[in-house]
């Protein structure tokens, strides 16, 4: 999994007037790192995780170019032609990655009302579109908005892919972005469904990366798709994850059922509690 | 400390009744099944079937089926394996196994020697 | 049923040395394999579950590979201990099989 930076900016409009404030959060490696919010822009970090990465001296520089940054694209939002009434919003993601072999990938994409009407190839400066014509029609909009003020712009919109790959490798060698492997606590749970059923629930949580294999297995052998609901891996705020995973057991089978789970080359299985104890931790490592 | 601890070594005749005991401690005993595991003199395991130690449940295989009776006492962790009519073939060892999962055996009793003669 | 064989029935094999054990199945059974140790005083232990998944407290000297028909169980440096009786068993499918055995010598 390569290493990655990832900016979200957001601006709003109402009434086809930009507002002042503006939103920005940053993603280092998948994880939330960095917000600036419509009000003031400080860059906060998320948890612990980013205070270890960015360290105190640094918040200036990164507030100054996310300041920068929200004032670029409330001009690209003011050169919408069809803005309408009522709210409309103008989002940049702009996404560089740093793969094992060293090669790198960068991206732009520009999304209106939620709705993605842009990508730019960072490396080969190629644009691609959707093909509905409102999308085509914002498309050509900003393009030519941003041609008219590459002066003006050249910093953000020429210089970014070197700019993110520049920010990403210095994340990268402050030491803390390593591929840090944070294991799950797993546990089981059980909650009476239909008469003589029940349901058993899985939960891993505070785990990172956020790739897992969470599932249930009958006898030792993995139950089919269809009889199990999963739940989408979701951060908890701390810099992990959460998940889980359930299905529904006749009452009184729950000894021949397990949960299984996969995390960063470590595997562990987890039983289900019997009658009225609630949560079993497994004795696997 | 998990630990799965058998009664000691029996020595029956022909056409009489065996009855084996396995004390579980240091878990929920009635959160895992038991198994039991025969390994006659010099040869393999061969699974004899399991308990299910919540509802009571026996699950026999097919060369078990007729002598053989798992039964449970789960007020006191235990759980038990008669033989019924002993024959000379039932000369072995009898493990009992903690039963994780219905696929795993991952706790093992000392194993009863029991000899049976004619 | 399922057929689990282990070929081999006895090993002799030098301290440090690496040895390998194979079980195979007489169908595919999905890696859904486990292995066992039997010390000569007859006490059984799980070493691995799965195919290759170490259960808590072996040693990391052992290992396990293996698809379809085929597996082993290796142990790269084997010591004093190692010396015993060795099984694999299927759980693809009831009723439950244990391979023969591999017992385990020092040269």
């Known amino acids: 999994e390569p290493h990655s930076l990832r900016y979200n900016l957001t601006v709003l409009s109402w009434d086809g007037s930009v507002q002042s404030g503006f939103l920005t959060e940053v993603h280092l490696d998948g994880q939330p790192f960095l917000r600036c919010d419509r009000q003031k822009c400080r860059a906060k970090p998320q948890g612990q995780w980013a205070e270890d990465v960015l360290g105190n001296k640094t918040w200036d520089r990164e507030t100054r170019d996310l300041t920068g940054n929200g004032k670029d694209l409330r001009m690209t939002l003011a050169h919408i032609k069809d803005q309408k009434e009522g709210l409309h919003s103008l989002q940049e993601i702009r996404v560089c990655e740093i793969h094992e072999d060293n090669s790198t990938r960068s991206s732009q994409h520009f999304y209106y009302d939620g709705e993605l009407f842009l990508s730019q190839n960072l490396e080969t400066k190629e644009w691609t579109m959707p093909q509905s014509s409102r999308a085509q029609t914002l498309a050509m909009n900003v393009r030519n908005f941003l041609k008219e003020d590459a002066m003006k712009t050249k910093t953000h919109y020429h210089a970014m892919h070197a700019d993110c790959l520049q920010e990403l490798r210095r994340y990268l060698k402050s030491g803390v972005v390593l591929r840090r492997t944070v294991p799950p606590m797993v546990n089981v749970t059980r909650s009476e469904a239909s008469e003589g059923n029940i349901t058993v629930t899985c939960r891993a949580s505070g785990f990172y990366p956020w790739n897992i294999t969470l599932s249930w297995r009958q006898d030792g052998v993995s139950l089919s798709h269809d009889t199990q609901q999963w739940g989408d891996v979701l951060p908890d705020g701390n810099g992990t994850y959460q998940t889980w995973v359930a299905t529904r057991i006749c009452q009184g089978e729950e000894q021949r059922f397990t949960c299984y789970m996969e995390h960063s080359g470590n595997h562990s299985t987890h039983p289900v509690p019997s009658g009225k104890v609630l949560v079993l931790q497994s004795h696997w490592q | 400390q998990i630990q799965l601890v058998q009664s000691g070594p029996e020595l029956k005749k022909s056409g009489e009744t065996v009855k084996i005991s396995c004390k579980a401690f240091g878990y929920t005993f009635t959160n895992y099944g038991m198994n039991w595991v025969k390994q006659a003199p010099g040869k393999g395991l061969k699974w004899m079937g399991w308990i299910n130690t919540y509802t009571g449940e026996p699950t026999y295989a097919d060369d078990f089926k007729g002598r053989f009776a798992f039964s449970l006492e789960t007020s006191a962790s235990t759980a038990y394996l008669q033989i019924n009519h002993l024959k000379n073939e039932d000369t072995a060892t009898y493990f009992c196994a903690r039963n994780y999962g219905n696929y795993l055996f991952d706790y093992w009793g000392q194993g009863t020697t029991l000899t049976v003669s004619s | 049923d399922i057929q689990m064989t282990q070929t081999t029935s006895s090993l002799s094999a030098s301290l440090g040395d690496r040895v390998t054990i194979s079980c195979s199945a007489s169908?595919?059974?999905?890696?859904?394999l486990n292995w066992y140790q039997q010390k000569p005083d007859g006490t059984l232990k799980l070493l691995i579950q799965?195919?290759?998944l170490l259960h808590s407290g072996v040693p990391s000297r052992f290992s396990g590979s293996g698809s379809g028909t085929e597996y082993s169980l290796t142990i790269s440096n084997l010591e004093p201990e190692d010396i015993a009786t060795y099984f694999c068993q299927q759980y693809s499918k009831f009723p439950r099989t244990f391979g023969g055995g591999t017992k385990l010598e020092i040269k």
């Open positions: 799965y195919t290759s």
């Open positions: 169908q595919g059974i999905s890696n859904y």
